[in-house]
Interface confidence: medium
């Protein structure tokens, strides 16, 4: 497997609306035009796939309609946004990039972005 360096921020704080955004940047050594980006979540030594998208260089990322992820691409950067997050979703979100086609195939896995999600305090009952 040909390795590829992937960089992503160490820490991101989700907004009060449960939205977190971060940039996943890969050092493309190849001439790929079809790229697959996968977001993995690691928590309690368990790794699960959050979302994935395949895109053509220069085009938009296309996630499944029911995906909690959206994203845009610019050169070797992918701007990822994860929505609908709650406190229980706090964890390490790892960006995995694959240069799918044409060969040779390259694989890069980032060190992960720790996303902290704080549930908003419920509004106190009003006497009015």
């Amino acid at each position: 497997c040909k390795a590829m360096h992937v960089a992503q921020p160490a820490v991101v704080l989700a907004s009060s609306r449960g939205i977190a955004s971060f940039v996943c940047e890969y050092a493309s050594p190849g001439k790929a035009t079809e790229v697959r980006v996968t977001v993995l979540r690691q928590a309690d030594s368990q790794v699960t796939e959050v979302c994935a998208a395949t895109y053509m260089m220069g085009n938009e990322l296309t996630f499944l309609d029911d995906s909690i992820c959206t994203g845009t691409s610019s050169g070797n950067q992918v701007n990822l946004t994860i929505q609908g997050l709650r406190a229980m979703d706090t964890g390490l979100y790892i960006c995995k990039v694959e240069l799918m086609y044409p060969p040779p195939y390259y694989l890069g896995i980032g060190n992960g972005t720790q996303i902290y999600v704080i549930d908003p305090e419920p509004c106190p009952d009003s006497d009015f």
């Epitope: 497997c1 040909k2 001439k31 035009t33 079809e34 395949t54 895109y55 053509m56 085009n59 799918m100 086609y101 044409p102 060969p103 040779p104 195939y105 694989l107």
Partner: antibody, heavy 124, light 107 residues
Framework: EVQLVESGGGLVQPGGSLRLSCAAS????????MHWVRQAPGKGLEWVSA????????YYADSVKGRFTISRDNSKNTLYLQMNSLRAEDTAVYYC?????????????????WGQGTLVTVSS | DIQMTQSPSSLSASVGDRVTITCQAS??????LNWYQQKPGKAPKLLIY???NLETGVPSRFSGSGSGTDFTFTISSLQPEDIATYYC?????????FGQGTKVEIK
């Protein structure tokens, strides 16, 4: 049995259009990159076009760019080649071929399954 | 575009002879090279992929070697059923290109 069967060839006048089809069976069509390769009478092989799994990625030889369009319908297990503005030099047997990615981490590609070919003749 | 030059363009050999075909790329293509056999009126058949790997079901008398720009295809002991045209093909970059072919005949 793994099989590719081309159809749609025939005689067409210069400037005309033709649509070739390639029906795949015996394998998971959507898991493979697909190609068209042609061979003019008595000549060698010439790669024409390729399309990735989803159909989003398309590639063409300079000689057909802007005139030919490759597409696929994974639900029908079928590959297509729409050929417009045909020229006499497009006369050839057109083969569809399966691109097998190989190696420990998919570092190469080879045409491991070929159709029988369909003849396209461009002549007035 | 990467040009692939095969030599010879044709050859005639006796049954049992060792046959060698060479393929030269116009630029370094690492080991990104395949070899195909095409019999008259038939579709090509993959013999060797990645310069030296024998495709499943292909007789062991066929072999390939080389890297960079110079590649060799060998039939260790020519058989009557090996009468065909042989093509090299690079997959280093698009457009994918083939050699012009080598026609092998029996003396």
């Amino acid at each position: 049995e793994v099989q590719l069967v081309e159809s749609g060839g025939g005689l067409v006048q210069p400037g005309g259009s033709l649509r070739l089809s390639c029906a795949a069976s015996g394998f998971t069509f959507s898991s493979y990159v697909m190609h068209w390769v042609r061979q003019a009478p008595g000549k060698g092989l010439e790669w024409v076009s390729a399309i990735t799994w989803s159909g989003r990625g398309t590639y063409y030889a300079d000689s057909v760019k802007g005139r030919f369009t490759i597409s696929r319908d994974n639900s029908k297990n079928t590959l297509y080649l729409q050929m417009n503005s045909l020229r006499a030099e497009d006369t050839a047997v057109y083969y569809c071929a399966r691109g097998r990615l190989f190696g420990l981490a998919l570092y190469g590609e080879a045409f491991d399954v070929w159709g029988q070919g369909t003849l396209v003749t461009v002549s007035s | 575009d990467i040009q692939m030059t095969q030599s010879p363009s044709s050859l005639s050999a006796s049954v049992g002879d060792r046959v060698t075909i060479t393929c030269q790329a116009s630029k370094d293509i690492s080991n990104y090279l395949n070899w195909y056999q095409q019999k008259p009126g038939k579709a090509p058949k993959l013999l060797i992929y990645d310069a030296s790997n024998l495709e499943t079901g292909v007789p062991s008398r066929f072999s390939g070697s080389g890297s960079g720009t110079d590649f060799t295809f060998t039939i260790s002991s020519l058989q009557p059923e090996d009468i065909a045209t042989y093509y090299c093909q690079q997959f280093n970059s698009f457009p994918l290109t083939f050699g012009q072919g080598t026609k092998v005949e029996i003396k």
